[in-house]
């Protein structure tokens, strides 16, 4: 597994850097998630043919997979930094039971989709010290991920490959849209 | 990295229009957020537009919203901006460079490969 951003050798290197910003330290960890889910999706597509799957056909599912729409202030159109804070922080959250469901989907990888996991919860606490008004984020229902979580792992395996997939575009897009927006704040 | 080649640029009037290419043989250019940036003579480097590995992601400077479209063709490894309403303050060498994590910024550090420009010239 790849080490955690601040741990890499440069900065061990590099002892009398100025220390990361908090919107530093947040963009770099995004890419080192970034750089795990191209690592989990590079073993997903070598073992099923999902990617080279449309996205039309894929968008048939019942997945309801957290999506930055115009409403949310994270785009240009729009934009508007508090409203889109909390989308992302609010999307993290929501994408956490599915984090959660890729544990154990991985034979070769099974590391780095724990590393995606638990950066993805530092990243979390990083993005609520920086949110204004945390009153506006709501936090998933644990009865509800638990069930949800339960109808995943039930599923045949080619739905569950096809889940896997889902799944890691999906939250690859959402960061991408996140960091964009996040480096105009 | 991938090699990145500018065209499209030349002298226009103002008022006219050019569409700019950045080109790359890589073959996971559509993977890579592209940005446009300019340099006119004795200033920095600025930034123009960008688009993201999701096509819809574009942001653009607020000198060139409403005039200058950025789009992308997968297929032809290429992405475009489109320059119309061109204005003498407009000239200047464009340069594109492409991010690999597909987020794009208007900031040059977020790039990490950079073509070698095109120069855009508006004049009567």
């Known amino acids: 597994a790849p080490v955690p951003p601040g741990e890499d050798s440069k900065d061990v290197a590099a002892p009398h850097r100025q220390p990361l910003t908090s919107s530093e330290r947040i963009d770099k960890q995004i890419r080192y998630i970034l750089d795990g889910i191209s690592a989990l999706r590079k073993e997903t597509c070598n073992k099923s043919n999902m990617c080279e799957s449309s996205k039309e056909a894929l968008a048939e599912n019942n997945l309801n997979l957290p999506k930055m729409a115009e409403k949310d202030g994270c785009f240009q159109s729009g934009f508007n930094e508090e409203t889109c804070l909390v989308k992302i922080i609010t999307g993290l959250l929501e994408f956490e039971v599915y984090l959660e469901y890729l544990q154990n989907r991985f034979e070769s990888s099974e590391e780095q989709a724990r590393a995606v996991q638990m950066s993805t919860k530092v990243l979390i606490q990083f993005l609520q010290k920086k949110a204004k008004n945390l009153d506006a984020i709501t936090t998933p229902d644990p009865t509800t991920n638990a069930s949800l979580l339960t109808k995943l792992q039930a599923q045949n395996q080619w739905l569950q490959d096809m889940t896997t997939h889902l799944i890691l575009r999906s939250f690859k897009e959402f960061l991408q849209s996140s960091l964009r927006a996040l480096r105009q704040m | 990295e991938v090699q990145l080649v500018e065209s499209g640029g030349g002298l226009v009037q103002p008022g006219g229009s050019l569409k700019l290419s950045c080109t790359t043989s890589?073959?996971?250019?559509?993977?890579?957020?592209v940005g446009w940036f300019r340099q006119a003579p004795g200033k920095e480097r600025e930034f123009v537009a960008d688009?993201?590995?999701?096509?819809?992601?574009?942001w653009y400077a607020e000198s060139v919203l409403g005039r200058f479209t950025i789009s992308r063709d997968d297929a032809k490894n290429t992405v475009y901006l489109e320059m119309d309403g061109l204005k003498p303050e407009d000239t200047a060498v464009y340069y594109c460079?492409?991010?690999?994590?597909?987020?794009?910024?208007?900031?040059?550090?977020?790039?990490?490969?950079w073509g070698q420009g095109t120069q855009v010239t508006v004049s009567s």
């Open positions: 460079a492409a991010d690999k994590y597909g987020v794009g910024g208007n900031a040059q550090g977020y790039y990490d490969s």
């Open positions: 890589g073959r996971r250019f559509s993977s890579y957020a």
């Open positions: 688009i993201g590995e999701q096509a819809e992601n574009t």
